[in-house]
């Protein structure tokens, strides 16, 4: 009997009642591998979730987040509110960055500017809630007579800010 | 100070139909996710789903589509829960609580519990 | 669905005693892993979320590691009030599920 079963395909399920036939899904239900006793009812994409991929017999629905909001989490389980960049979620919604840190997304958190003086470099250009320092050339290699051989470092790119 | 009171207790007949309401205060009602988790006796915590009130449309675990529908009224910061087609197993503590970042995701603040009881 | 296994399911401890709880998920959640607090004829209480994060308020004697697929709670010196059932949650995966809880009770 068991191997009838591992005959059915995906897209349908072992029926019990019918002898261990192959029967398809019902209407928004899938079966993603073979050998199912049952098949799985389909995920609905509703409210701040909208419907990336429809459900089929075979896979389940994939969702997205509406304007506005973001995935987090695996195949989108969670939808998070959008910011501005110069902003971050708190629990009393978004904030602005705190003086001396920044969000250049509208996800995540606000981070410390970069301290140039740890690397030995100045600043060229100012921090501001959006975008992170620019460091330049240390102080020693802009002083008169100082060589000029080494080309500045490249604005750090700032890296993904965590989920 | 966010709150969540709930409606009493209620004893309902099997293949009945049971309302849980959840009225909000202290915060921004519209703007956060009201989720409804449930714990039968002795058991553990189970999602059923959840609304952001400014969309209106709820989202359901699919244990419970079809049977459950969650709403919200904007007016009077509430949220309701209602399930039908009532059995012995749906015998529970319903909570509502509230999530204030990322949609389902965790929940900061519950109501106290409201138990509902089939028996026939 | 995400299977969230907890251990053990009951833990007998005394006031004073460094307390660690396990949580396994079925499938990686990466940190998407919070842990409520409960006691009897009460709503569960958020304690930590993302793993690690201590929520506003929860005193710093509980703390929170993991990833992937293997978590543990922490409570470095348990006091009369921590005595209760503990639940982890994940939420990475639709539907978000929770652990079936880990009675911390008086030896």
């Known amino acids: 009997l068991q191997d009838l079963c591992s005959n059915c395909p995906a897209g349908t399920f072992c029926d019990n009642n019918r002898s261990q036939i192959c029967s398809p899904c019902p209407p928004n239900s899938f079966s993603s591998a073979g050998g199912q006793r049952t098949c799985d009812i389909c995920r609905q994409c509703k409210g701040v979730f909208k419907t990336r991929k429809e459900c089929s017999s075979t896979s389940n629905a994939e969702c997205d987040c509406i304007s506005g909001y973001h995935c987090l989490g695996a195949e989108c389980s969670m939808c998070e509110q959008d910011c501005k960049q110069g902003q971050e979620l708190t629990k009393k919604g978004c904030k602005d960055c705190c003086f001396g840190t920044f969000n250049d997304q509208k996800r995540g958190i606000c981070r410390p500017w970069t301290n140039c003086s740890l690397d030995g470099k100045s600043v060229l250009v100012n921090g501001t809630k959006e975008r992170d320092v620019v460091c330049g050339p240390s102080p020693a290699d802009l002083s008169p007579g100082a060589s000029s051989a080494t080309p500045p470092a490249p604005a750090r790119e700032p890296g993904h800010s965590p989920q | 100070q966010v709150q969540l009171v709930q409606s009493g207790a209620e004893v309902k007949k099997p293949g009945s139909s049971v309302k849980v309401s959840c009225k909000a205060s202290g915060g921004t009602f519209s703007s956060y996710a009201i989720s409804w988790v449930r714990q039968a006796p002795g058991q553990g915590l189970e999602w059923m789903g959840g609304i952001i009130p400014i969309f209106g449309t709820a989202n359901y675990a699919q244990k419970f589509q079809g049977r459950v529908t969650i709403t919200a009224d904007k007016s009077t910061s509430t949220a309701y829960m209602e399930l039908s087609s009532l059995r012995s197993e749906d015998t529970a503590v319903y909570y509502c609580?509230?999530?204030?970042?990322?949609?389902?995701?965790?929940?900061?603040?519950w109501g106290q519990g409201t138990t509902v009881t089939v028996s026939s | 669905d995400i299977q969230m296994t907890q251990s053990p399911s009951t833990l007998s401890a005394s006031v004073g005693d460094r307390v660690t709880i396990t949580c396994r998920a079925s499938q990686s959640i990466s940190s998407w892993l919070a842990w409520y607090q409960q006691k009897p004829g009460k709503a569960p209480k958020l304690l930590i979320y993302d793993a690690s994060s201590l929520e506003s308020g929860v005193p710093s004697r509980f703390s929170g590691s993991g990833s992937g697929t293997e978590f543990t709670l922490t409570i470095s010196s348990l006091q009369p009030d921590d005595f209760a059932t503990y639940y982890c949650?994940?939420?990475?995966?639709?539907?978000?599920?929770f652990g079936q809880g880990t009675k911390v009770e008086i030896k």
């Open positions: 949650q994940q939420v990475n995966s639709y539907p978000q599920t």
């Open positions: 609580a509230r999530s204030s970042g990322a949609y389902p995701g965790y929940f900061d603040y």
